[in-house]
């Protein structure tokens, strides 16, 4: 049960989180005029990935897109990339923990295989949420190196007679929104992980008879793992997760008294 | 067809108040600020300040913070400016302009401040 | 807040001559942002509200005629009719749209001689 709703838990915050990655991705106000110097300012600048744009003393906003590929700085490029990585790797990962869900019945999908999809949906939100945190970093970087940078040539004279303030940028919502998405994605990735560790099938015991050809010893071998003589269904050695989180329905590992003969 | 429809002339006492309105249509009325704008006998112009019918936010000119009050009624896609404490001053007529680059403009109304 | 300064006040033309009015402004009105000049220039003709003619320093709104052209950047901007018609006589301000208040020049008369 608790494994269930730690699963479930995890893909609906990795869910919400993608959403975010993708609206952050999507707004246009990465970074936004800095008002402190020019607070009487009608017209207002902002940007985003895709598009800058203005908005004027009558209240409309015009945007222009970036149309060219080359002439964008390289970081901007980097922190595209970066975001639209890391929504790729979220919608993958959606899709594959849709069907990883321990609620969710698909054909005879065994626990391992579910284990497993849990664990790759974990591993690519958290790769997910990582990339939007760096992309939006990167810009929010980019935006603190140009902000003092403008500051230190705050006033440009106009043939000595004139002052214009140049226009700075500071941290759009846009920002926040990203920083906020990608830690929800990679929490619900480590939720995932951690729900794949109860979902793991473990060695079932054989508690009243031990089956094996005349002849042969079964042995129990230390170190987690059981030793197998080839015949019945065992043939796999397998890890027993000791100390790890156990639901109810989950039948105990430790060896007992009837394990061997 | 864009039009900005202001009601007609006010004649008022000192330290009176008035309240006159600007009716849009033909455009989307929330995409726009609506701004006014009064204009001496004579003389140039001078912008009061502006609301936004969207969410109601305005902006004044500090010289007539006090003076002049701007409300909206979205459903009926009316602007108004109420103007308190009237002086021989305040005698002239009040224009409301709005969409991009206050390209449209009312017909003006003339308030009349006399004893 | 900005100071629009026009000049000449008053000019007397003739029918088809080409005339320049002028406009400067206290501060630069071009936005870094989209590398646009912030300033409206007006055509007031007696009884009727102000109406367009050039926005953002030169872009000429639909219906203006050709005749009209807006120049400039930064502080100082320059209204040229071509060739003036009888139409044309009113006032003509210049406005900052750049920064709040919103603030307009004094205007220039423009009469037949």
């Known amino acids: 049960m608790a494994v269930t709703a730690c699963q479930g838990l995890g893909f609906v915050v990795s869910l919400i989180g993608i959403a975010g990655i993708i609206a952050a991705t999507c707004m246009d106000q990465w970074s936004t005029q800095d008002l402190y110097n020019n607070p009487v300012t009608a017209v207002f600048n902002y940007q985003g990935l895709w598009r800058s744009c203005v908005r004027e003393s009558s209240g409309f906003t015009e945007c222009r897109g970036y149309f060219t590929l080359l002439g964008l700085p390289a970081m901007l490029q980097a922190v595209r990339a970066l975001m639209i990585v890391g929504i790729v790797l979220g919608a993958i990962g959606l899709l594959v923990s849709i069907f990883a869900l321990k609620c969710i019945r698909i054909g005879s999908m065994e626990d391992s295989a579910k284990a497993n999809m849990t664990l790759t949906s974990g591993i690519m939100f958290i790769v997910s949420g990582l990339c939007a945190i760096a992309g939006v970093s990167v810009f929010a970087n980019m935006l603190v190196t140009n902000f003092w940078m403008s500051t230190a040539n705050m006033y440009t004279g106009m043939g000595g007679m004139v002052q214009t303030v140049q226009t700075r940028y500071t941290f759009g919502a846009a920002l926040f929104v990203g920083w906020v998405a990608g830690g929800l994605t990679l929490i619900g990735g480590v939720m995932m992980c951690i729900a794949c560790r109860g979902l793991a099938p473990e060695e079932t015991n054989y508690k009243a008879v031990s089956y094996h050809a005349s002849g042969h010893s079964v042995a129990y071998k230390p170190g987690g793992f059981k030793a197998s003589t080839g015949f019945g269904s065992n043939t796999k050695n397998k890890k027993i997760y000791d100390g790890g989180a156990r639901t109810e329905d989950e039948v105990q590992s430790y060896p007992s008294k009837h394990d061997y003969v | 067809e864009i039009q900005l429809q202001q009601s007609g002339p006010e004649l008022m006492k000192p330290g009176a108040s008035v309240k006159m309105s600007c009716k849009a249509s033909g455009y989307s009325f929330t995409s726009y600020y609506i701004h006014w704008v009064k204009q001496s006998h004579g003389k140039s112009l001078e912008w009061i300040g502006y609301?936004?019918?969207?969410?109601?936010?305005?902006r004044y000119n500090q010289k007539f913070e006090g003076k002049a009050t701007l409300t909206v009624d979205k459903s009926s896609t009316t602007a108004y400016m109420h103007l308190s404490s009237l002086t021989s001053e305040d005698s002239t007529v009040y224009y409301c302009a709005s969409l991009r680059f206050l390209a449209y403009w009312g017909q003006g109304t003339l308030v009349t401040v006399s004893a | 807040d900005i100071v629009m300064t026009q000049s000449p006040s008053s000019l007397t033309v003739t029918a088809g001559e080409k005339v320049t009015m002028t406009c400067k402004s206290s501060q630069s009105l071009l936005n870094s942002g989209n590398q646009k000049n912030y300033l409206t220039w007006y055509q007031q003709k007696p009884g009727q509200p102000p109406k367009v003619l050039i926005s953002?320093?030169?872009t000429r709104q639909s219906g203006v005629p050709d005749r009209f052209t807006g120049s400039g950047s930064g502080t100082d901007f320059t209204l040229t009719i071509s060739s003036v018609q009888a139409e044309d006589l009113a006032v003509y301000y210049c406005?900052?749209?750049?920064?709040?208040?919103?603030?307009f020049g004094a205007g220039t008369k423009l009469e037949l001689k």
């Open positions: 609301i936004d019918p969207f969410n109601g936010g305005t």
């Open positions: 406005q900052n749209d750049y920064s709040y208040p919103l603030t």
């Open positions: 953002r320093a030169s």
